[in-house]
């Protein structure tokens, strides 16, 4: 006669996150009495996952009526899958006594558990930098399993190349997490312009997830000044002024020296905005040239975005 | 469905018998069989359980002077060494107790231990 | 070895009344749930009620229902049947293989 075998007829098992997971068991006999238990992993750390004499486990149900007269079915769904449910499961029959003893094992199902990659998170740097400088950009995502992903970078639609990439950790785990730094160069024309991180997985079913960060948070285009005398508009008025082009962020002051003194400061309000996203802006400055017997030296002093200033100077002329 | 016990009879006291019980419409294989036995006017009293090889067991009473066996279609209880008290009718029954109860039983067969 | 009481050992009922039978165990049965209960009449091999404390067996009536656990077990027939005037046996199994006993039984009657 034979004797009792425990039967796990499905060698590996895969379950996306948050569903249930069928672990199929089935015994050739009734006999000798005693529970089923299941347990994952192996050994003496071996868990507890369901017993059928004994304990309450919320998470887990009989797949057939374990209390039917000649129920050899002990399969069991796990409710609510997570990645940290991966592991070997393992169907153990036990012979009643005091205490019970392990009378056979079946082979084992292996549970992978497949879950979504949170949705990437793009970071830049902490400060603003200039055209042509490199600046570098992170990207991060989290508790997504099997391991296997695939990450792209783009500007404006453009793929990158010069990106490094880190999935951990490097052996096996319940769940894996990506890091990718990218290198940009900044142009005077990226105010407009976006830094995308895709993440694809097996999990999203051909359709990847997206992290987007703008450019307009990381550059700082300076503006060019140009300083011009206007045609006099009163007898002994001159009216100079000062075109502050193609800057980014908004954030200017701007003061009027006269020979060496400040004679007015303010700050950038009415602004017009180009098609690439800087902006323009213009002060004048009226000059009595009546108070001045000599030559007027005229500077106009920008400071952007809390950066040191730049300045622009007109020789203003007085005819005695 | 059924189970049917043969082999009871009269026996003298330190002799031996042997009991079969026979299962027709399902198997024996996947099932313990479990022997019973009920002295005239008394109650029910569990002898054994006989399931494979070496999964047999046994009331303390009966261990050494009973013994149980089964194929596929037939169990078989030996008993030795009988005494007076062990007069009663031996039922099988189909099971092992807990999640596995004793669902179907034979008819029974009168064992008379007597000089 | 693990002892079962039943009591009472005898009772005397009506068709239709409410029957209750206890059974007490020395200790803890098996799993708190190994505890079947048995219906035998005169001349015939008992029948299977009642297992696991509280599962009905195949095709008994409903009118059949076990409750317990540990040590104290009880087999209620809500409304007694003429069919249904016999002896009734628990079955109580301790943590051993080999400790299975019967309790000495209960004969209901008719009033």
């Known amino acids: 006669e034979e004797e009792l075998q425990v039967i796990q007829p499905d060698k590996s098992v895969s379950v996306a996150a948050g569903e249930s997971a069928i672990l199929h068991c089935t015994v050739t006999s009734l006999i000798p009495v005693g529970p089923i238990q299941w347990f994952r992993g192996a050994g003496p750390a071996r868990e507890l996952i369901y017993n059928q004499k004994e304990g309450h486990f919320p998470r887990v149900t009989t797949v057939s009526e374990s209390t039917k007269r000649e129920n050899m079915d002990f399969s069991i769904s796990i409710s609510n899958i997570t990645p940290a449910d991966a592991g070997t499961y393992y169907c153990v029959k036990f012979r009643k006594g005091s205490p019970d003893t392990e009378f056979k094992s079946g082979a084992g199902t292996e549970l992978s558990v497949r879950a979504k990659p949170s949705a990437p998170v793009v970071s830049g740097p902490a400060a603003r930098a200039t055209p042509q400088h490199t600046v570098s950009f992170t990207c991060e995502s989290h508790g997504f399993s099997p391991r296997d992903i695939t990450l792209k970078w783009f500007k404006n639609g453009n793929e990158l190349s010069d990106f490094q990439t880190n999935v951990d950790p490097v052996g096996e785990s319940v769940s894996y997490s990506i890091h990718s730094t990218a290198k940009v160069v900044l142009t005077r024309e990226d105010v407009h312009s976006q830094v995308i991180c895709e993440v694809a997985h097996v999990t999203l079913q051909g359709d990847p997830l997206r992290g987007t960060a703008n450019l307009s948070e990381t550059i700082r285009v300076p503006p060019t000044l140009e300083v011009t005398q206007q045609p006099v508009r009163a007898e002994n008025q001159v009216n100079v002024t000062c075109q502050v082009r193609k800057f980014y962020p908004q954030r200017l002051q701007l003061t009027w020296l006269e020979n060496g003194n400040v004679s007015r400061t303010e700050t950038a309000s009415t602004v017009t905005e180009n098609k690439d996203g800087t902006y323009n802006w213009m002060s004048w400055l009226l000059v009595n040239v009546s108070a001045h017997r000599d030559d007027v030296k005229l500077t106009c002093q920008v400071e952007h975005d809390g950066q040191p200033a730049v300045s622009k100077s007109h020789d203003l002329k007085v005819s005695a | 469905r059924q189970l049917v016990e043969s082999g009871g009879g009269l026996v003298q006291p330190g002799g031996s018998l042997r009991l079969s019980c026979a299962a027709s419409?399902?198997?024996?294989?996947?099932?313990?069989i479990s022997w019973v036995r009920q002295a005239p006017g008394k109650g029910l009293e569990w002898v054994g359980t006989?399931?494979?090889?070496?999964i047999t067991y046994y009331a303390s009473w009966a261990k050494g002077r009973f013994t149980g066996s089964k194929t596929s279609s037939t169990a078989y209880l030996q008993m030795t060494s009988l005494r007076a008290e062990d007069t009663a009718v031996y039922y099988c029954?189909?099971?092992?107790?807990?999640?596995?109860?004793?669902?179907?039983w034979g008819q029974g067969t009168l064992v008379t231990v007597s000089s | 070895d693990i002892v079962m009481t039943q009591s009472p050992s005898s009772l005397s009922a009506s068709v239709g009344d409410r029957v209750t039978i206890t059974c007490q165990a020395s200790?803890?049965?098996?799993?708190?749930?190994?505890l079947a209960w048995y219906q035998q009449k005169p001349g015939q091999a008992p029948k299977l009620l009642i297992y696991?404390?509280?599962t009905l067996a195949t095709g008994v009536p409903s009118r059949f229902s076990g409750s317990g656990s540990g040590t104290d077990f009880t087999l209620t027939i809500s409304s007694l049947q003429p069919e249904d005037f016999a002896t009734y046996y628990c079955?109580?199994?301790?943590?051993?293989?080999?400790?299975?006993?019967f309790g000495q039984g209960t004969k209901v009657e008719i009033k």
């Open positions: 029954a189909r099971g092992s107790a807990w999640n596995d109860p004793f669902d179907y």
């Open positions: 419409g399902f198997s024996l294989s996947s099932h313990g």
């Open positions: 006989i399931g494979t090889g070496v």
């Open positions: 200790q803890s049965v098996y799993g708190n749930n190994d």
């Open positions: 696991l404390a509280s």
């Open positions: 079955l109580g199994g301790g943590d051993d293989e080999a400790d299975n006993t």
